[in-house]
Structure formats: C-alpha cells, structure tokens
Interface confidence: low
C-alpha cells in the first residue's frame, strides 16, 4: 500500500512522508518562515539581500515537484484501489469458476499488474531521488544563507553595540557641554559685573587723575616760579652783601630785571623748563590779557601751541564770528583757541603750522606749512600759508592764495552760497574749497558721503569726515 502525509516536526519545520508498502520516505525541508519578520530589530530584507538570487526559483521548482509527487501518489492510490477491487472480483470469479480452471489467466493478470506496479514504483523512486537531490542542494544553499545571515546578524549586533556605546558617550559629552555652558554663563555674568565695577572705578580714577594732573601742572608752574624767585632773592641778597662789604660801593642798588613769569606761547613755556603737556595760561603779546591753551610738549620736539582740536564731537563748532574770535570749547578736549590771539601771535614773529589728521581706519597723516599767519580782524583773519610738506601734502587742502575766515553770521567766502551755513563751522572757505576741519562731527559708519563733515580733501576725498584733527603752531626758529 502507499500513502502521502504532510506534517510539522518539533522544530517547526515541514516534513513530507511518503509510505509505499513496507518502505517509508521522509523529507525534511527548511522553510523561509524561519527568517525574522520585519518587525524584528533587523529588517529581513537586509539579510535576504545577501542570499543567492536563484533562491525563489528553487522554492518554486520544489513546489512543482511536490505537485508532481502528489499527483503520482494519488494515481498510485487509485491504482491500488483498482487492483484491490479487481482482485476481489477475480477471487469471486475464481471461487465461482474454480471448476473451469482459469487460474493461469488470473496469475497472468496478477503478474501484469505487479509488473505495472513495479514500474510505477521505479518511476516514483526516480522522482524521489530527484526530490532528494534538489532538497539536498537547497539545504546546502540554505545552510550557506544561514551562515551568511548569522555573520550579518553578528556584525549588526556589534554595530548596534558600538552605536549604543557612542550614544552613551555622546550623552555624557552633551551633559558635560551643558554643565560647562552653565559654568561659562555664570563666569561671563561675573566678569560683566566685575567689568562694570572696574569701569566705574576707572571713570572715578580718571576724574581723580584729571584733577591731580591739573593740580600737578599748577604745582609745577608754582614750584618753578618759586625756585626762580628764591634764586633771584639769593642773588639779590648776595649782591647786597657784596655791596655792603665793599668800601667803594655806590649808594644806588642795581635792581635786576624781573624774571619772566608770563608766556606768549608754549615754546616759551617749554624753554623755561616746563616740559609736561597740559593746559597753560598764555598772555596776549603787548598786553596783560590772558588765554588758556593746551601745550603739546612731546610731539615733534614739543613746544606746540594747540589752536584747534577735534576728537569726539562733544563741542558744537557751528559758532558765531565773535566766538571764533575769542575762542571756545575745552582746552583739554575739543576747542578753538581764538582767531584774535592767533592773529596777534603770528604777526609778532614767524610761525609754522602743523595739521595732524586721523581717519576711522587707524591711519594718521599731517600737513606742515613752513610759514603761517592770520591777518587782522579788519581783513577777516585771512590765512597766509607757504612751504607745504608732510604726508597729506601733495596739494594744499587750504585754498591758495589764502581765503578770508567765514562763520554762519559772517559770510566772506568766494561762493554765491554761504559756505559756513551749508557746510557747518567757521573756516577759511573758498567756494567752498577742499577743506573744513570745523565741520559737523560724524561718528564711524556715518562718516562717508558727508559734504558738511570734517574734511581734508587731499588726503581722504570730498565726502569723508575725519575722526580727529589737531592744528598746532610753533615759532619757526624753535
């Protein structure tokens, strides 16, 4: 007899069992079910991608063979039934017709049937062998796939482990960074507070220093004068003693010329031995009228009388004729010394004029005129300049020949416009000319394309407003 069974073994694999008479054939086939599903941490396609490309074909071919095997099995079962039925009939007939002695014929039929069965069994054995070969091949392939999959799984597990390690490390570092940021913020805040405190302290100290500097200058001047007076007194005493002890002494006492205690300019102060830059009191020539001026005792050998300074826009330079005549501002900062004093001073002896310039990019330049003087007020303080040298001196930025001085209320320029009103500040405007160091002060980033700014054309062009300027004078024979 023969039958065919399909079942599942204890490992969950499908098994195919064919029983043919006393022989029983069992086929254990690996299943694709054993692959992990996509819900697994590792996607199934990631593994299958490395499997041989003919795997699906093999499975299909196996299914075809299964179908053939089933068909053959069913055909054998039908044949078996047919034989059994026929045998029953034949046996009855034999029993009924035993007398007729047809045994030989029956044996022949039986033999024929047996031969057919044997042939069929051989065919089935061939099919089984084919199935076994195919199964073995598939098993080998699947074994290779399994090994490959195991390797991949191991690699993935290693990588995952590595990723987890890195993630942990990253989290640790992130926490560290956050902690550092927190500390940094605290430190910054602390530093800001310290900075603010220091700024307050610095500003306090600055004002104290300013006061001390002023006191020092005054003390220095007083000290120098006292020393001179003491020296004079000693000389006078000695002179008197000599006269008293001399038998041929005359009754009249030679009175020494009074020591100079007034100064016309910073050069005289410098030559008197006072060589510290600062604010000093100057006296108008041939007069007792005084004026405060800043003396630069360091730059270019010292002895410079500052007649103009711009540095921060703290002083308004759009002033009247009278203000420009007598001067305005603060000698320690932005100021104009005064046209009347400068005119009187520069007409007493020959002076040089140095103009020092600073731009917003940190560059510095200067123009030096070897001879400078201002006419009197009757001639509108007209400027006279000759002998130009310096780093900003290809062409004079103060128009030649010299122009009259103009202010917002006294228009003496060569333009039908009013240059001082339009360009701001008092200056020796031409029409309106290539310079104006008394123009509107513009801060950085707002200092370009300004026609009314602090201009020195032959250094920075027409629309550039300078950061700082200083005009200073000194005797030519210093």
């Amino acid at each position: 007899y023969s039958n065919f069974r399909k079942s599942v073994d204890s490992t969950g694999r499908r098994q195919y069992q064919v029983q043919n008479g006393p022989c029983s054939y069992t086929f254990l086939l690996p299943e694709t079910d054993s692959c992990r599903s996509s819900s697994s941490p590792y996607m199934s396609n990631a593994v299958q991608r490395d499997a041989p490309l003919d795997y699906d074909d093999s499975v299909q071919r196996l299914q075809v063979l299964e179908n053939i095997l089933e068909n053959n099995t069913q055909w054998l079962m039908k044949l078996e039934n047919y034989i059994q039925d026929n045998m029953k009939k034949e046996m009855v007939e034999i029993q009924q017709n035993v007398v007729q002695n047809q045994t030989a014929v029956m044996i022949e039929i039986g033999t024929s049937l047996l031969n057919q069965t044997a042939a069929q069994t051989r065919k089935l054995t061939d099919v089984e062998a084919q199935v076994l070969n195919q199964t073995t091949r598939l098993e080998l392939q699947l074994l290779q796939h399994s090994i490959s999959t195991n390797k991949l799984e191991k690699q993935i597990l290693d990588q995952t482990s590595e990723i987890n390690k890195l993630q942990n490390k990253n989290s640790f570092l992130e926490q560290k960074v956050l902690d550092m940021e927190g500390k940094h913020s605290e430190q910054l805040q602390s530093m800001k507070e310290q900075k603010d405190e220091l700024q307050v302290l610095v500003s306090k100290q600055s004002s104290v220093i300013d006061e001390l500097e002023k006191k020092l200058v005054t003390a220095t001047v007083n000290n120098s004068l006292l020393q001179k007076q003491q020296h004079d007194l000693m000389e006078t005493v000695n002179s008197l003693l000599t006269m008293m002890s001399s038998p041929n002494s005359k009754s009249s006492v030679a009175i020494r010329k009074e020591e100079q205690t007034t100064f016309r300019d910073c050069a005289e102060i410098f030559k008197s031995g006072l060589t510290t830059s600062g604010i000093y009191t100057l006296t108008f020539p041939n007069s007792t009228e005084e004026i405060k001026a800043y003396c630069d005792m360091e730059a270019g050998g010292g002895g410079w009388t500052i007649i103009q300074r711009r540095e921060d826009g703290s002083v308004d330079f759009q002033r009247t004729w009278k203000e420009y005549k007598v001067g305005f501002g603060n000698p320690s900062g932005e100021y104009w010394l005064g046209n009347e004093f400068v005119s009187q001073l520069t007409n007493q002896q020959r002076y040089v004029l140095k103009i020092h310039l600073k731009d917003w990019e940190g560059n510095e330049a200067y123009s030096l005129y070897e001879h400078f003087y201002l006419s009197s007020e009757e001639l509108n303080y007209r400027i006279h300049l000759t002998g130009l040298t310096g780093t900003a001196a290809k062409i004079s930025s103060i128009s030649q020949p010299g122009s009259d001085f103009s202010t917002k209320d006294s228009d003496n320029d060569k333009c039908i416009c009013k240059c001082s009103q339009m360009l701001s500040g008092g200056w020796w405007f031409d029409a309106c000319g290539p310079s104006n160091l008394n123009g509107q002060y513009y801060p950085q980033k707002q200092n370009t394309n300004k026609f009314n700014g602090i201009k020195w054309y032959y250094w920075k062009g027409s629309g550039y407003s300078l950061k700082a300027t200083t005009m200073m004078i000194r005797p030519a024979d210093f």
């Epitope: 128009s399 333009c415 039908i416 416009c417 240059c419 009103q421 339009m422 360009l423 031409d430 029409a431 309106c432 000319g433 290539p434 026609f451 201009k455 054309y457 027409s462 629309g463």
Partner: antibody
C-alpha cells in the same frame, strides 16, 4: 570771474553721436564736482550726469545710461559729454554746471548752454 | 525717483504784489530743496538752497520755507526783473527738478 562755455552742439541724425565740451575758467576745476543738465525746448530742467573732482566717480540718469559718458580733463580745465545712439527725445539745450560743494547737487554756476537737435 | 510737482503752472501777478509759488515732493526730502530762476534765453540762477537760505547776492524779497514734502517760494513785492520761470529742485536723493512755474505780468 567764474565762467563756463559749452560747445559741440548741433544737428545730428537719430543713432548718431556728438561730443560736448565745457571750458571752465575763473576757478580750479579739480576742486569741484561738475554736472550736465539739459532742457528740452519749452520744457523743464533735467539732470543728466555728474563727475567727482578727480573723475573717479561718475553718475548718469537712467534714460542715458549706456549711451552718454561724462568725463573731465582737470589739466585743461574741461568737462565733456560723449553722446551716442542719439534719439529724438535727447533734443535739448545742454548746460554744464558747477556743483556748489561735494556733490550736494546744488548748481551755483551755469554755462549759457549748447543746443543739440536730433532729427532726420 | 523723487518727483517734484510745482503749482500753479502759470501765475499772473501785478508788479509790487506778492507771489507765492508751491512745490511738492513725492516723498520727504527734509530741507534739501533749492529754487532757481530762469529768464528766456538764459541759464538758471540759484536763489534759495536748504529750503530757506538765500544764496549770496539774492535780494531779501525772495524767501523760502517748508520741509518734508511741502515747500513755498515767496516773492514779497514783485519787481519787473522778477518775471521769469521758477524751478524747484531736490537734492536729497539724486537730483530732480519740478516742471516750473511761470510768473507773468498781470
């Protein structure tokens, strides 16, 4: 005395070219921005172009950009306007004018003008 | 561009009378406005700049006022030599003129 005299105007066909000149005297040309301003017959004034003291910056009104070019020769105290691809609408009296100060666009001195006629 | 509009186009005034000319800017130009006078066959002449400052040599009868977008030129007592065309011009952003106001004898 400040004086400016234009020359070079005349009749020209559409698409043609002309070069206007302005001779300046009585002031130092190199110290001023200079401009060309035009006036169509019976119409208003229109600023055409200007040029910085040293010639390093030039500006033109949109309607003439690419066709007109302003230039100067400070050594010769002269201002120029090269005009090409002329159109009928360029017909006008062309004045050269001195900018009062640093491109403020205030014209304190003007020439008497030169007439440019573009017609076929 | 900034458009300058003048009104009226023509103003008829008798000698000795006051003339008021208006100029409007399409956007604020602060006080960056000038007035020019032009007589037939002549070049323009600068009268006022900065909206209200008279140029050198300009008689006191000419005065300017306004800021932002509305400006006025006033001729307090018209003289025979004042009959001409008057142009306003802005120099706040590039340079543009109004179309002009003709002041004629009434």
């Amino acid at each position: 005395e400040v004086q400016m005299v234009e020359s070079g105007g005349g009749l020209v066909q559409p698409g043609g070219s002309l070069r206007l000149s302005c001779a300046a005297s009585g002031f130092t040309l190199r110290s001023y921005w200079m401009s060309w301003v035009r006036q169509a017959p019976g119409k208003g004034l229109e600023w055409v172009a200007n040029i910085k003291e040293d010639g390093s910056e030039k500006y033109h009104v949109d309607s003439v950009k690419g066709r007109f070019t302003i230039s100067r020769d400070n050594a010769e105290n002269s201002l120029f306007l090269q005009m090409s691809s002329l159109r009928a609408e360029d017909t006008a009296v062309y004045y050269c004018a001195r900018d009062m100060e640093a491109s403020a666009g205030l014209f304190d001195y003007w020439g008497q003008g030169t007439l440019v006629t573009v017609s076929s | 561009e900034i458009v300058m509009t003048q009104s009226p186009a023509t103003l008829s005034v008798s000698p000795g009378e006051r003339a008021i000319l208006s100029c409007r800017a399409s956007q604020s130009i602060s006080s960056n406005l000038a007035w020019y006078q032009q007589k037939p066959g002549q070049a323009p002449r600068l009268l006022i700049y900065g909206a209200s400052t008279r140029a050198t040599g300009i008689p006191a009868r000419f005065s300017g006022s306004g800021s932002g977008t509305e400006f006025t030129l006033t001729i307090s007592s018209l003289q025979s030599e004042d009959f001409a065309v008057y142009y306003c011009q802005q120099y706040n952003y590039w340079w543009t003129f109004g179309q002009g106001t003709k002041v004629e004898i009434k």
